[in-house]
């Protein structure tokens, strides 16, 4: 396979209908969730938002790839969204769900 | 390949000599850095410390595995360590380095 691109945020729109949640979620119909993907390879440059541990792990992986994996590309900033939905008693509830939208990614 | 085990913390001792840092780091000689590895597969149970986004991404991955990856196994809790080292002017410095030790892992 080709070399993967560096760890970064990718756009992803999630439709609640596609997830089969349309019967209990009233609004929105979906949202821009996004996701993180890409390589966390040496050298980890500034835009990869790498932790100190990720930098150490990258060096150990290069030395010892059979036992220690590369760090992985994961969200570093997440936002909430508000959802209007029916609860179990068919009441309409407005609730803020934390950590639903990826705003930024990094190597962890 | 076989099913990988679920996302969890793995023990890893890092020797500063192996990293080639022995000439500038005085103490410690190394430290228990640990690392995260394993699958973030459906269903994401409680001990996987999954974010709401990771739960959504897992469902989207099941629907569309070619385009959206599984969430990745990454540190959820990191600790600092204190390091005694020589700076560029050969002064001995004691500094606390953040995010050096993995304490817990989760699906992100």
């Amino acid at each position: 396979s080709e070399l993967k691109t560096a760890c970064k945020k990718h756009e992803l729109y999630v439709s609640f209908q596609d997830l089969g949640w349309q019967d209990w979620i009233i609004a929105p119909k979906g949202y821009a969730a996004n996701y993180c993907d890409g390589e966390c390879s040496f050298p980890l440059n500034a835009h990869m938002n790498a932790t100190n541990h990720a930098i150490v792990q990258t060096l150990v992986h290069l030395m010892n790839p059979e036992y220690v994996p590369k760090p992985c590309c994961a969200p570093t900033k997440l936002n909430a969204i508000s959802v209007l939905y029916f609860d179990d008693n068919s009441n309409v509830i407005l609730k803020k769900y934390r950590n639903m939208v990826v705003r930024a990614c990094g190597c962890h | 390949s076989e099913l990988k085990t679920a996302c969890k913390k793995h023990e890893l001792y890092v020797s500063f000599q192996d990293l080639g840092w022995q000439d500038w780091i005085i103490a410690p000689k190394g430290y228990a850095a640990n690392y995260c590895d394993g699958e973030c597969s459906f269903p994401l149970n409680a001990h996987m410390n999954a974010t709401n986004h990771a739960i959504v991404q897992t469902l989207v991955h099941l629907m569309n595995p070619e385009y959206v990856p599984k969430p990745c196994c990454a540190p959820t809790k990191l600790n600092a360590i204190s390091v005694l080292y020589f700076d560029d002017n050969s002064n001995v410095i004691l500094k606390k380095y953040r995010n050096m030790v993995v304490r817990a892992c989760g699906c992100h």
Partner: antibody, heavy 121, light 112 residues
Amino acid sequence: QVQLVESGGGLVKPGGSLRLSCAASGFTFSSYVVHWVRQAPGKGLEWVGRIRLETHGYAAEYAASVKGRFTISRDDSKNTLYLQMNSLKTEDTAVYYCARVERSKSGFDNWGQGTLVTVSS
Amino acid sequence: QSVLTQPPSVSGAPGQRVTISCTGSSSNIGAGYSVHWYQQLPGTAPKLLIYGQSERPSGVPDRFSGSKSGTSASLAITGLQAEDEADYYCQSWDSSQTLVVFGGGTKLTVLG
């Protein structure tokens, strides 16, 4: 001392199957990643595949040339590595070595003596 | 064709110094992965000679040394001896295709 001993090689017809074993002794087998490497007569070394540890779910990876035909497994209770070879081709003729990966720098620090697999009609 | 490129053969007289090169790419040696070297005497299994670029396992004479720069690595043998006549292979790890990659091997001939 560390020892790896392969067995199970022999003559097999194209399309046939063979199962190789690698018996390990003198070390804690379950703590080491192990690989199969082969060498066709008069040729260089070719990586076949590897199997990781229990903590990594015994994940196995393969070279493109054998993927889908060969399966690597291990039995830590028996200190044994296996290579199941199906749909064998004449180009699979080689000496097959098992090799242990040392734990700090990932080099193959111990090799078996090899077992010859000949695929011919 | 091997992912890592080595010269098919090198030769030298006893006592001389020879080097064997191993050229890779940005997805293996150039990506920072360790390089290991193996010696294979005729009719025997390979033996680890150098690991992690430049470290020698116990029992390997200090006449053997390894180095790495950019996308290449090299093995140097000083004070060449008749018993050094063997095939030498470099090996690394590759993030773009197969995991483990080998060089095609270099046959070292000790002259005279």
